[in-house]
């Protein structure tokens, strides 16, 4: 799913207030809901009819430093007999997410939001058949 | 997929530098890769064997203000005949993502990162059956 553009409103102060100095704003340390948990430790990537593998990208100047990308294993989907059914397609499910980019020059550290496109997993779909008129 | 905890390192200055004043840091305005686009196949939520619907949540003090959540339509998966196969299960694919929370008191505006659990779509899985030896 797509993250809409920021425009020029969200990060600005109300019109009646003095503008933000130097094109930056105050980001409080700490993360709300940091202990929230994903309950997906169940190997669904291997047991799906559209299975996928994970690749981890690592960047120490990004938060989170670790971003996991899924890649569909097959073009078709896996049927009940464990064989690939090429009348169906495994397609990626993608999600735009935000990360924080750290920029530093000596002791001057600043941060900036960055949009990253993450493939979260795969699903099995019926291909669209375009009939000739 | 799960976002690891921040710990106390990412948002801190190097040890040799003076600490960040007031528990906040500088966040530059603007978003890197803002024009990046999601290239997901069309209508996959309806064409999937584990179809889903979308619900939009809106919060003007969050960026992005709009967060889209998927809900699987069925418990089972849809077979080639368009019938629900209850020997297979439609399960949600979840992803932890970051959003920015805006907090303001008068002209004093600050921001904080927040973790949000998003259901991105659904996939069809074979439940694990533990056979008796």
């Amino acid at each position: 799913r797509k993250i809409p553009k920021v425009g020029h409103t969200f990060f600005q102060k109300p019109e009646s207030c003095p503008p933000v100095p130097g094109g930056s704003m105050k980001l409080d340390i700490g993360i709300i809901n940091e202990n929230q948990r994903v309950s997906m430790s169940r190997n669904i990537e291997s047991r799906s009819t559209s299975p996928w593998n994970y690749t981890v990208t690592w960047d120490p100047n990004r938060y989170p430093s670790e971003v996991v990308q899924a890649q569909c294993r097959n073009l078709g989907c896996i049927n009940a007999q464990g064989k690939e059914d090429i009348s169906m397609n495994s397609v990626p499910i993608q999600q735009e997410t935000l990360v924080v980019r750290r920029k530093h020059q000596g002791c001057s550290v600043s941060f900036q939001l960055e949009k990253v496109l993450v493939t979260v997993g795969c699903t099995c779909v019926t291909p669209v058949i375009h009939h000739v008129q | 997929r799960k976002i690891p905890k921040v710990g106390h390192t990412f948002f801190q200055k190097p040890e040799s530098c003076p600490p960040v004043p007031g528990g906040s840091m500088k966040l530059d305005i603007g978003i890197i890769n803002e024009n990046q686009r999601v290239s997901m196949s069309r209508n996959i939520e309806s064409r999937s064997t584990s179809p889903w619907n979308y619900t939009v949540t809106w919060d003007p003090n969050r960026y992005p203000s709009e967060v889209v959540q998927a809900q699987c339509r069925n418990l089972g998966c849809i077979n080639a005949q368009g019938k629900e196969d209850i020997s297979m299960n439609s399960v949600p694919i979840q992803q932890e993502t970051l959003v920015v929370r805006r907090k303001h008191q008068g002209c004093s505006v600050s921001f904080q990162l927040e973790k949000v659990l998003v259901t991105v779509g659904c996939t069809c899985v074979t439940p694990v059956i533990h056979h008796v030896q």
């Epitope: 169940r42 | 339509r73 418990l75 089972g76 209850i86 399960v91 439940p127 694990v128 059956i129 533990h130």
Partner: antibody, heavy 123, light 106 residues
């Protein structure tokens, strides 16, 4: 231990609606499906449908589509089954029953049952 | 829908006897569950996935079968086993139950 506690008996007039609740405890409500089963007097058990509190997914027996509506309130760990346009043939005991988690057990793998709620439709 | 037909509908047996209840499916199924329902009580899971004993169920109960024919066996019946027994499948939508077999203790 797993417990499913259902709301009390109901007597309704034909054409009315009734909403039966099922409060779950002893497990993580979101992680398991909840099913509803009808048992008319001395009759076989009839599966009505099931709902996944986590994904929102629902599955109905065609015979109960338009008759029963399944919902959940995850904050209260409670499942609901609403019957509309009641008729005398809806007189029965209705059970909620826990299904599987979809990962280690099939969603339709029913193990624990509530005590049942008697719904009587009479003019 | 898959129709499950149990046999017999009713059986009167003496304690210590061996009891066999069969469940025949109108189409092949992968697994069968069995439930016990005592008078004025809710059903209780006895056997899951054809042959697995549910927790707390005495070992005198056992299940077997495949395809369209499944069996629930009670070795050495006890008085507390007086109940109605139901088979159930979740191979095909909708999930269905057998009509029940009522066991009476003589």
């Amino acid at each position: 231990q797993v417990q499913l506690v259902q709301s009390g008996a109901e007597v309704k007039k034909p054409g009315a609606s009734v909403k039966v609740s099922c409060k779950a405890s002893g497990y993580t409500f979101n992680e398991y499906t909840m099913h509803w089963v009808k048992q008319s007097h001395g009759q076989r058990l009839e599966w009505m449908g099931g709902i996944n509190p986590n994904s929102g997914g629902v599955s109905y027996n065609q015979n109960f589509k338009g008759k029963a509506t399944l919902t959940v309130d995850t904050s209260a760990s409670t499942a609901y089954m609403e019957l509309s346009s009641l008729r005398s043939e809806d007189t029965a005991v209705y059970y909620c029953a826990r299904g599987g988690d979809g990962y280690y057990t099939n969603y339709f793998d029913i193990d624990y049952w509530g005590q049942g709620t008697t719904v009587t439709v009479s003019s | 829908e898959i129709v499950l037909t149990q046999s017999p509908d009713f059986q009167s047996v003496t304690p210590k006897e061996k009891v066999t209840i069969t469940c025949s499916a109108s189409s092949s199924v992968n697994y069968m569950h069995w439930y016990q329902q005592k008078p004025d009580q809710s059903p209780k899971l006895l056997i899951k996935d054809t042959s697995k004993l549910a927790s707390g169920v005495p070992s005198r109960f056992s299940g077997s079968g495949s395809g369209t024919d499944f069996t629930l066996t009670i070795n050495s019946l006890e008085a507390e086993d007086a109940a109605t027994y139901y088979c159930q499948q979740w191979n095909s939508h909708p999930l269905t139950f057998g009509q029940g077999t009522k066991l009476e203790i003589k």
